[in-house]
Amino acid sequence: ALDAAYCFRNVQDNCCLRPLYIDFKRDLGWKWIHEPKGYNANFCAGACPYLWSSDTQHSRVLSLYNTINPEASASPCCVSQDLEPLTILYYIGKTPKIEQLSNMIVKSCKCS
Amino acid sequence: ALDAAYCFRNVQDNCCLRPLYIDFKRDLGWKWIHEPKGYNANFCAGACPYLWSSDTQHSRVLSLYNTINPEASASPCCVSQDLEPLTILYYIGKTPKIEQLSNMIVKSCKCS
């Protein structure tokens, strides 16, 4: 799996999970989240050569097409596969509320 | 939806469905599929600005992050959403067989 266990331990130009810390105020302009101040969102990036963690038959076809036709703009892209939620604290006036924001943290990647 | 009905009628730089015909022999080097000789595979391509057909909360966060930090390499990518199968004719020796290959045709796209 193209997850932290593999990607953070290997220098990998191909599609892999990359570390990314997001500060809510600085990076997103969000002032409404009180806790946490930021989080490890991570992201997916890297090349998708033939058979590198292809998601579907179409992405396999596309990466093979791209190998044979390298000048073409059609190629698979490295995107998130498994995502996890993030629990946040925010306020309604003076009343604290806890909410779980779904699909906030990328845990693994795929070529799609 | 970023499908043929929308994307093939509009000139769109942002993430959208693009037409792509694949000839099995010429483009993939596949001789084993006897019919069809090729098919309209299509592909997804284009920019993913903030809120342009974002797939998850993470892709919305990432596109907003990318707007505020344009020099960053972290940004969502335009990938396939709905896919359809393709029915093919192949041979076992001299015996013809029909098979449905799943996820071969892209019908719509998303920013993920």
């Epitope: 058979l51 | 993939l28 080097g29 596949w30 001789k31 084993w32 093919i88 192949y90 041979y91 076992i92 020796g93 001299k94 067989k97 098979e99 290959l101």
Partner: nanobody, 126 residues
Framework: EVQLVESGGGEVRPGGSLRLSCVVS????????IGWFRQAPGQEREGLGC????????WSADSVKGRFTISRDNVRNTVYLQMNALKPEDRGVYYC???????????????????WGQGTQVTVSS
Amino acid sequence: EVQLVESGGGEVRPGGSLRLSCVVSGFTKDYGAIGWFRQAPGQEREGLGCIARKDGDTWSADSVKGRFTISRDNVRNTVYLQMNALKPEDRGVYYCAGDPSALYGCSDRSSEYQYWGQGTQVTVSS
């Protein structure tokens, strides 16, 4: 890198048996088609049979049906040609050929295979 290596050829009496092996490397797991061919002196290469590695579907030419059987062992990445009731006309160089792109099926035509083994000699004489 795709490679096919045959072994198991030799000399046998009419009515005898041989099992040829073709070790396949460089193929995607369980995918691809393997064909067996033979070439007798001064003759065209003849398709004997083939197998789809994924689902194990096989085909045998009429000339060897009931005598020759093709099987696969995907763990060992090996395809076998079991030859029984051998006849003098079965002599020749036996080749295995591979098409790693095949998701399904296998061909009886030599032109559809990109990769070939070095061949193994089979002699049938009393």
